[in-house]
C-alpha cells in the first residue's frame, strides 16, 4: 500500500483491544481545504515505541488503515480511497508493547466536517439568577455550534455539561455556580447539525471564584499611642488565599479576592467624615479614638461577609496638659498647639455613661497664640459641660479634618463641669477628740474626687475664735481625714474644709464649731 492511501488490507498487528486505561482518545477529523483532510488525536500514556494507525470503515463495510507511525496527526486527500461525501466511521488503533489500544469511534461525513475552534479570546463571566453566565464572541465563520463545558473544583474531577445549540455572533452558556469553592471551566464547540462532527479542542481555562468570597480570617493589633498622638494599626495575620483548581494555579485572573479595610472613627462624631476604605497594602495610623475596623472581602461577583473588630479608645490621660479658666462670660480651655492651621475636635462625655453620649465641637482652623497655645471657649448658655459632674475630655487635631487617617490625639483628661468650686465642697465634716490637745477632722470625699486628676488637694482651715488666729493645713486628695494638734482646752474653734483643683480654689464648707473640754483632776 502507498503511504498516501488508505490501505484496504489487514493491519500489521493482531486485532485485540487491550482495554487499558491509556491509549488514543479525542479523535477529530475535518476538511482543511477543498480537497484535503486532517485527523488528529491525543495519546495518553508512555509514547516510546508506540505506532498509530488511523482506521476507516466505509458504509459498504470495507475497512482500511493509514499508518501514522509515532505522529498523532495525519493528512490525506480526497483521492486516498476514503469516501468523503458519504458517512464513514473512523478510529485510531495504537500498537504498543505487544498490545492494541483503540480510541472511541467517530462517524461523520468528511466533506461537511469543518474544523471548529473553541471559544477564543475573552470569555466574559457574570452572575445571573444564582447561575454562572459565560459569553464570548463566535469564532470567525463558525456561526452555528453545539457547545459543551466541563468544570472541576480543587477537590472534584471534571464534570461534563451542555450549553445547548448556538446560532449567533455571540455565544453563551449557563453553568452551575459554587457557593464556597473556586471552579475551573473549559468550553468546546462543534458544528451544529453535522452528524458526528468532531469537537474542537478545549478552551483555555476560565477560572471562576465562589459566589461568596471567603470570610477574611485576620487579626489586628494596635501599637501604643506615640508622642505625636497616633498609633499604628498592624495586621497580625494576612487573609488566607483561596484554594484553586489545578488549571487555575499560578496566575488565575477571575478568582482574585480583594480585601479592603473599612475604618470607622467612632469618637468625635461632629467631624465631616466618619468612614474611609483603604487597601490592605498599607496599614494606617490612628488617633487614640475608638474605631470599628472591618475587613471586607470581595470578588468579581461583589462583596462577601466582613469581619469587624472594635478598637477601644486609648484612655491614657494627661492631667496637666489642659488649662481651664472659668470666667463670668464662660469657660476657656488652653492646651499646647500642634501646628499652624490645625482643626481641633473637643469631645466630652459624662464619666460612667455610654460612649454613645459623647458631645463634641469642631474648631475652625487655628494657629497657635503667642504663647504657643490653642484655645476653645464656650459660654454658660451653651450648656456645654454645664452639669456639675465629671466629664472625660479628649482633644483631637488634624490639618485635614475631612481625612479620617490624619487625626491625632492631643490630650485626654478629666474636667468637673458646672460650678465645680461649689459642687466640690466637702460635706459631713465631723470633729472627734483625739488627745488632750488635738482633734481628728473627717469629711466625706468631695464630688471632685470622682474625677481623676481634678482634685489637687483639700485644705483644712482652723480658726481660734478667741485670738482670731487662722491656720490652714493642706491634705492629699486621697485623704479625707487630718489631725489638728497644738490646740488649747476650753478655747472655741471653727473648722472648715475646701477642695481645690489645679485651676480653681474651692468653696469652704460650713464652719464646724468645737472645743476641747478642760480636764478637771480629781
Amino acid at each position: 500500500c502507498r503511504t498516501s492511501e488508505c490501505c484496504f488490507q489487514d493491519p500489521p498487528y493482531p486485532d485485540a483491544d487491550s482495554g487499558s486505561a491509556s491509549g488514543p482518545r479525542d479523535l477529530r477529523c475535518y476538511r482543511i481545504s477543498s480537497d484535503r483532510y486532517e485527523c488528529s488525536w491525543q495519546y495518553e500514556g508512555p509514547t516510546a515505541g508506540v505506532s498509530h494507525f488511523l482506521r476507516c470503515c466505509l458504509s459498504s463495510g470495507r475497512c482500511c488503515y493509514f499508518a501514522a507511525g509515532s505522529a498523532t496527526r495525519l493528512q490525506f486527500s480526497d483521492q486516498a480511497g476514503v469516501s468523503v461525501l458519504y458517512t464513514v466511521t473512523l478510529w485510531v488503533e495504537s500498537w504498543a508493547r505487544n498490545q492494541t489500544e483503540k480510541s472511541p469511534e467517530v462517524t461523520l461525513q468528511l466533506y461537511n466536517s469543518v474544523k471548529y475552534e473553541p471559544p477564543l479570546g475573552d470569555i466574559k463571566v457574570s452572575k445571573l439568577a444564582g447561575q454562572l453566565r459565560m459569553e464570548w464572541e463566535t469564532p470567525d465563520n463558525q456561526v452555528g455550534a453545539e457547545v459543551q463545558f466541563r468544570h472541576r473544583t480543587p477537590s472534584s474531577p471534571w464534570k461534563l455539561g451542555d450549553c445547548g445549540p448556538q446560532d449567533d455572533d455571540t455565544e453563551s452558556c449557563l453553568c452551575p455556580l459554587e457557593m464556597n469553592v473556586a471552579q475551573e471551566f473549559q468550553l468546546r464547540r462543534r458544528q451544529l447539525g453535522s452528524q458526528g462532527s468532531s469537537w474542537s479542542k478545549w478552551s483555555s481555562p476560565v477560572c471562576v471564584p465562589p459566589e461568596n468570597p471567603p470570610q477574611p480570617q485576620v487579626r489586628f493589633s494596635v501599637e501604643q499611642l506615640g508622642q505625636d498622638g497616633r498609633r499604628r494599626l498592624t495586621l497580625k495575620e494576612q487573609p488566607t488565599q483561596l484554594e484553586l483548581p489545578e488549571g487555575c494555579q499560578g496566575l488565575a485572573p477571575g478568582t482574585e479576592v480583594t480585601y479592603r479595610l473599612q475604618l470607622h472613627m467612632l469618637s468625635c462624631p461632629c467631624k465631616a467624615k466618619a468612614t474611609r476604605t483603604l487597601h490592605l497594602g498599607k496599614m494606617p495610623y490612628l488617633s487614640g479614638a475608638a474605631y470599628n475596623v472591618a475587613v471586607i472581602s470581595s470578588n468579581q461577583f461583589g462583596p462577601g461577609l466582613n469581619q469587624t473588630w472594635h478598637i477601644p479608645a486609648d484612655t491614657h490621660t494627661e492631667p496637666v496638659a489642659l488649662n481651664i479658666s472659668v470666667g463670668t462670660n464662660g469657660t476657656t480651655m488652653y492646651w499646647p498647639a500642634r501646628a499652624q492651621s490645625m482643626t481641633y475636635c473637643i469631645e466630652w462625655q459624662p464619666v460612667g455613661q455610654d460612649g454613645g453620649l459623647a458631645t463634641c465641637s469642631l474648631t475652625a482652623p487655628q494657629d497657635p497664640d503667642p504663647a504657643g497655645m490653642a484655645t476653645y471657649s464656650w459660654s454658660r448658655e451653651s450648656g456645654a459641660m454645664g452639669q456639675e459632674k465629671c466629664y472625660y475630655i479628649t482633644i483631637f487635631a488634624s490639618a485635614h479634618p475631612e481625612k479620617l487617617t490624619l487625626w491625632s490625639t492631643v490630650l485626654s483628661t478629666y474636667h468637673f463641669g458646672g460650678n465645680a468650686s461649689a459642687a466640690g465642697t466637702p460635706h459631713h465634716v465631723s470633729v472627734k477628740n483625739h488627745s488632750l490637745d488635738s482633734v481628728s477632722v473627717d469629711w466625706a470625699p468631695s464630688l471632685l474626687s470622682t474625677c481623676p486628676g481634678v482634685l489637687k488637694e483639700y485644705v483644712v482651715r482652723c480658726r481660734d475664735e478667741d485670738s482670731k488666729q487662722v491656720s490652714e493645713h493642706p491634705v492629699q486628695p486621697t485623704e479625707t481625714q487630718v489631725t489638728l494638734s497644738g490646740l488649747r482646752a476650753g478655747v472655741a474653734y471653727t473648722v472648715q474644709v475646701r477642695a481645690d483643683t489645679a485651676w480653681l480654689r474651692g468653696v469652704w464648707s460650713q464652719p464646724q464649731r468645737f472645743s476641747i473640754e478642760v480636764q478637771v483632776s480629781d
Partner: nanobody, 124 residues
C-alpha cells in the same frame, strides 16, 4: 496651590510599553500622601490602577494590571511614575494622577488633588 501634571501618554501597539509621569507641586512627598493612578475608559467608571505611599513606598495594584504595571516615586523630584508593560487594548483610557493626604492607601476615589489626565490608546 497644588498641581499635578501627567505626561507620557500616547498611542502604542498591543504588547508595547509606556511610562507615565506625574509631577507634583505645592505638596511635599516627605509628608504622608497616597499618590496614584486612576483611569477612565469611555462609558466606564473611574478605577484605581496603582497607588504608592510617599512615606514608606507601600504599593497597591489592581488585579487587572498586576505583573504588568510598576509604580515608583522619586521623592526628591516630587514625581511618581507608572511603567506600563505588555499593554492590552483594554488598557485604553484617560489616566489621571491623584494625591491624597492620608496615612493609608484609600481605595475610594475621594482624593483631594487631581491632574488633568493623559490619554493612553492601545491598538490591536
Amino acid at each position: 496651590e497644588v498641581q499635578l501634571v501627567e505626561s507620557g501618554g500616547g498611542l502604542v501597539q498591543a504588547g508595547g510599553s509606556l511610562r507615565l509621569s506625574c509631577a507634583a507641586s505645592g505638596i511635599t512627598f516627605d509628608d504622608d500622601y497616597a499618590i496614584g493612578w486612576f483611569r477612565q475608559a469611555p462609558g466606564k467608571e473611574r478605577e484605581g490602577v496603582s497607588l504608592i505611599s510617599s512615606s514608606d513606598g507601600s504599593t497597591y495594584y489592581a488585579d487587572s494590571v498586576k505583573g504588568r504595571f510598576t509604580i515608583t516615586s522619586d521623592n526628591a523630584k516630587n514625581t511618581v511614575y507608572l511603567q506600563m508593560n505588555s499593554l492590552k487594548p483594554e488598557d485604553t483610557a484617560v489616566y489621571y494622577c491623584a494625591a491624597d493626604p492620608t496615612s493609608g492607601l484609600p481605595s475610594d476615589d475621594e482624593y483631594d488633588y487631581w491632574g488633568q489626565g493623559t490619554q493612553v490608546t492601545v491598538s490591536s
